[in-house]
C-alpha cells in the first residue's frame, strides 16, 4: 500500500506593518503542536504594498481598499484555503499615523476605520487595526530579534544555529529606524531605569526581563530630514539652500508648504519671503554631520544620563541588532560588514557624500532618484544618531550588528506583535500548566 502524506498541521498569521513611507504584509507559519516552543515561527512571505504609507490616503480614504488589494490577494494565494478562516490578521500603524493623529484624531480614526472595513472583507480572521505606541514598537522589535536569535531558549548549545549568536543567553538590544521614528530597546546592566515611561517588565519562558525602551517621534530618517531642512532654511539668506547632506551638483525645489506640513517641523516654522526654495547639494560629510547634531538637544538632562532632548538613556549594554532603515541604508552603502570599523564607516561616508550627483546617478542607475539622493543624508544621520544620540563609541561600534533577516524572517516589530497577540510567548516554561491571558506580555 502507498503511504499517504498526512496534511501538514500548521498555522498561519498575517501582520501588516503600516509604516510612514509604505505598508508591508508579513505572513508567518508555525507547527500547530509547537506553539509555545521558542523559535518555531518563521516568515514565509513579505509583500510590500505598492505606494506610500496609509497616512497619505487621508484625502482619499475610499481608495485604501484598492491600495491593499494586491498584497491581500497574495496572502490568499500563499495560505491554503482551508486555513483562511482561522488565520488571524493584524494591522499595526506606526509613527506616520501617530503624526497624523497629532494633527487630527478624526482624520486618523477615519483612515483606520476604512482600513478595518477593507480588511474585514477578506476571508481571514481579521483582529483589528490600531496605531501601536512607540513603546510597543520598541518592545516588539526587541522580542522579535531575541526570539529569532534563540535568546529565550533555556537549552544552552555548544554550537551556533543563527548568525550573531553567542552561547550565552544575554539578550540583544534592538535599534529600529523608520521613516518617522526611531526606537532603542535593551536590558541595562543592573541599572535602575530612572524614568518609568521607559521601563518594561516581561516574564518570558520563566525568566524576568527589565527592559529599557524609548521611541523618538520625528527622528526617523524622513522626518529628521524635514527637520534639518526646516532648521537650515531659517538662516538661509535667500531661496537657495546650499546643503552639505546632498551630493555636489544635486538640485531640488521644495515647497515651503510641504516643509511645514508635518508636526515635526513646527518648532522651526517661520514666515519666509518665498513659497519655494532650491536645495543645492555641496556634499560635505562633516558639515552635514554638524547640521544634524543641531537637531539633538543635549544641553538639558534631568537624569544621570540622557540620549538627547532630555530623554533618559542608561549606559549601553551588550550587543545590538540594528534593523529596518538602519540596515537598508547601511546595506546600500555596503557598510553592514562586522569587519568595518566606525572610523572606516565615517571615511566611506565622507567619500560617498563628496561624489558628484551625475556620477552617483550613473553608478546607481537602477535606484529611484528620490531615494538615491537621500543616502548621503541617511548614512550621516545614522552615524550621528548612533554616536552622538545614543553614545556608541568607536569601541562599542563593533557591538552593533546590522541585521536584515534572521533565519529568513525580517527583523522588525511585526513578529513580536503577532507572537504576543496570539499568546505564543508563555510567561513560564512550556512544560508548566496553561496560563491565563494576563500572564502573557
Amino acid at each position: 500500500t502507498q503511504n499517504k502524506a498526512l496534511p501538514e498541521n500548521v498555522k498561519y498569521g498575517i501582520v501588516l506593518d503600516a509604516g510612514s513611507s509604505h505598508t508591508s504584509l508579513y505572513i508567518y507559519k508555525w507547527p500547530a503542536e509547537k506553539e509555545n516552543d521558542t523559535g518555531v515561527v518563521h516568515q514565509v512571505e513579505e509583500c510590500r504594498v505598492k505606494g506610500p504609507g496609509i497616512s497619505k490616503f487621508v484625502q482619499k480614504v475610499n481608495e485604501i481598499g484598492i491600495y491593499l488589494t494586491d498584497c491581500m490577494e497574495r496572502a490568499r494565494e500563499v495560505i491554503p484555503r482551508s486555513q483562511h478562516q482561522e488565520t488571524p490578521v493584524y494591522l499595526g500603524a506606526t509613527a506616520g499615523m501617530r503624526l497624523l493623529r497629532m494633527e487630527s484624531e478624526e482624520l486618523a480614526d477615519r483612515v483606520l476605520d476604512v482600513v478595518e472595513r477593507s480588511l474585514s472583507n477578506y476571508p481571514f480572521d481579521f483582529q483589528g487595526a490600531r496605531i501601536i505606541t512607540g513603546q510597543e514598537e520598541g518592545a516588539y522589535g526587541w522580542i522579535t530579534i531575541n526570539y529569532l536569535l534563540g535568546k529565550f531558549s533555556q537549552k544552552t548549545r555548544w554550537f551556533s544555529i543563527v548568525p550573531y549568536e553567542t552561547n550565552n543567553q544575554e539578550t540583544f538590544g534592538a535599534l529600529d529606524l523608520g521613516g518617522a521614528s526611531t526606537q532603542v530597546t535593551f536590558v541595562p546592566q543592573n541599572q535602575t531605569i530612572e524614568s518609568p515611561d521607559n521601563a518594561l517588565q516581561f516574564r518570558l519562558y520563566g525568566k524576568d526581563y527589565n527592559v529599557y525602551t524609548h521611541s523618538f517621534l520625528c527622528y526617523g530618517k524622513d522626518q529628521a530630514l524635514w527637520q534639518k531642512l526646516a532648521k537650515d532654511i531659517q538662516v538661509a539668506s535667500n531661496e537657495i539652500l546650499r546643503d552639505p547632506c546632498f551630493h555636489p551638483g544635486y538640485k531640488k525645489v521644495v515647497n515651503v508648504s510641504d516643509l511645514y506640513k508635518t508636526p515635526c517641523t513646527k518648532r522651526f516654522e517661520m514666515t519666509l519671503p518665498f513659497q519655494q526654495f532650491e536645495i543645492q547639494g555641496i556634499g560635505n560629510y562633516q558639515q552635514c554631520h554638524q547640521s544634524i547634531l543641531e537637531l539633538f538637544n543635549t544641553s538639558y538632562c534631568p537624569y544621570s544620563q540622557c540620549a538627547f532632548n532630555g530623554i533618559f538613556l542608561p549606559p549601553l549594554q551588550g550587543d545590538f541588532g540594528a534593523f529596518s532603515a538602519f540596515y537598508f541604508v547601511m546595506k546600500f552603502l555596503n557598510l553592514t560588514s562586522e569587519k568595518v570599523s566606525q572610523e572606516k564607516v565615517t571615511e566611506m561616508m565622507k567619500k560617498f557624500c563628496a561624489q558628484p550627483w551625475e556620477e552617483i546617478k550613473t553608478s546607481y542607475a537602477g535606484v529611484k532618484e528620490k531615494y538615491l539622493s537621500e543616502y548621503c543624508f541617511s548614512g550621516t544621520y545614522i552615524l550621528s544618531l548612533l554616536l552622538q544620540g545614543y553614545h556608541f563609541t568607536a569601541d562599542s561600534w563593533e557591538h552593533i550588528h546590522f541585521i536584515g533577516k534572521i533565519q529568513g524572517s525580517d527583523a522588525g516589530w511585526t513578529l513580536g506583535y503577532m507572537l504576543n497577540l496570539t499568546n505564543m510567548i508563555p510567561a513560564e516554561q512550556p512544560l508548566s500548566t496553561p496560563l491565563s491571558h494576563s500572564t502573557y506580555v
Epitope: 510590500r48 505606494g51 497619505k56 484598492i66 488589494t69 497574495r74 477593507s118 472583507n121 529611484k368
Partner: antibody
C-alpha cells in the same frame, strides 16, 4: 518625468522568437507592476500579463502562458516580453504600461509608445 | 474568463453634449467591497490612457468632465460636456481576476 521607451519595430518569420524591451526612466519599476498589452491592427486591446519586478511574480492570460515570457531587470529598470513560436496572428502593436499609486497616493498610468511586431513568411 | 460587452459600438454626438458609454460584465467584477472596473481612452496612433479606475476614481490629470459609475456587472462612463479632444475609442477593462479582460471598445465620433 516618467518615460517608457520600447524597442523598435520587428519583422519576424513564423516559428521564430522575439524579445521586446521597455526601459523605464524617472521611476523605479520595483515600486509598481509592469503590464503588457497588445493590439492587433484595427482591433481592440488584449491584456497579456503582468510582472511584479520586486519579486518576479508573473500573471498571464492563459492563452499566452507558455509561449510568452515576462521578465524584469530592476538594476536597469527594464522589463521584457519574449514571444516564441511566433504565428501570423501575433502581428500587433505591443505596449508596456505601469499603473498604481505614487508616493503621494496619486494613481498614475504610464505607457510605452508601442512596438510593432509583424510576423510574416 | 470574464467577458465584457460595450454598447453602443459607435456613438455619434456633437460638441457640448453628454456621452454615456456602457460596459456590462458576464459576472460581477466586485470583490472585497471594490468594483474592479477601469476605463481607457485611445486615440489613433497613440497608446491608451487611463481615465477611471475602480469604477469611479479619476486617473491622474483627467478632467472632471469624465466620470464613472456602477457596480457588480453594469458600469457607465459619462463625459459631459463633450470637447473636441474627447472623440476617440473607449475601452473598459476588468481587473478583478486574471486574465484582466478588455471590452471590444466604443468609438465616440463627432456628429
Amino acid at each position: 518625468q516618467v518615460q517608457l521607451q520600447q524597442s523598435g519595430a520587428e519583422l519576424k518569420k513564423p516559428g521564430a522568437s522575439v524579445k521586446i524591451s521597455c526601459k523605464v526612466s524617472g521611476f523605479s519599476i520595483k515600486d509598481t507592476y509592469v503590464h503588457w498589452v497588445r493590439q492587433p491592427p484595427g482591433k481592440g486591446l488584449e491584456w497579456i500579463g503582468k510582472i511584479d519586478p520586486a519579486n518576479v511574480n508573473t500573471k498571464f492570460d492563459p492563452k499566452f502562458q507558455g509561449r510568452f515570457t515576462i521578465t524584469a531587470d530592476t538594476s536597469t529598470d527594464t522589463a521584457y516580453l519574449e514571444l516564441s513560436s511566433l504565428r501570423s496572428e501575433d502581428t500587433a502593436v505591443y505596449y508596456c504600461a505601469l499603473y498604481g499609486y505614487d508616493d503621494d497616493a496619486y494613481y498614475f498610468d504610464y505607457w510605452g509608445q508601442g512596438t510593432m511586431l509583424t510576423v510574416s513568411s | 474568463d470574464i467577458v465584457l460587452t460595450q454598447s453602443p459600438a459607435t456613438l455619434s454626438l456633437s460638441l457640448g453634449q453628454r456621452a454615456t458609454l456602457s460596459c456590462r460584465a458576464s459576472e460581477s467584477v466586485d470583490n472585497y467591497g471594490i468594483s474592479f472596473m477601469n476605463w481607457f481612452q485611445q486615440k489613433p496612433g497613440q497608446p491608451p490612457r487611463l481615465l477611471i479606475y475602480a469604477a469611479s476614481n479619476q486617473g491622474s490629470g483627467i478632467p472632471a468632465r469624465f466620470s464613472g459609475s456602477g457596480s457588480g456587472t453594469d458600469f457607465t462612463l459619462n463625459i459631459t460636456p463633450l470637447e473636441s479632444e474627447d472623440f476617440a475609442v473607449y475601452y473598459c477593462q476588468q481587473s478583478k481576476e486574471v486574465p484582466y479582460t478588455f471590452g471590444p471598445g466604443t468609438k465616440l465620433e463627432l456628429k
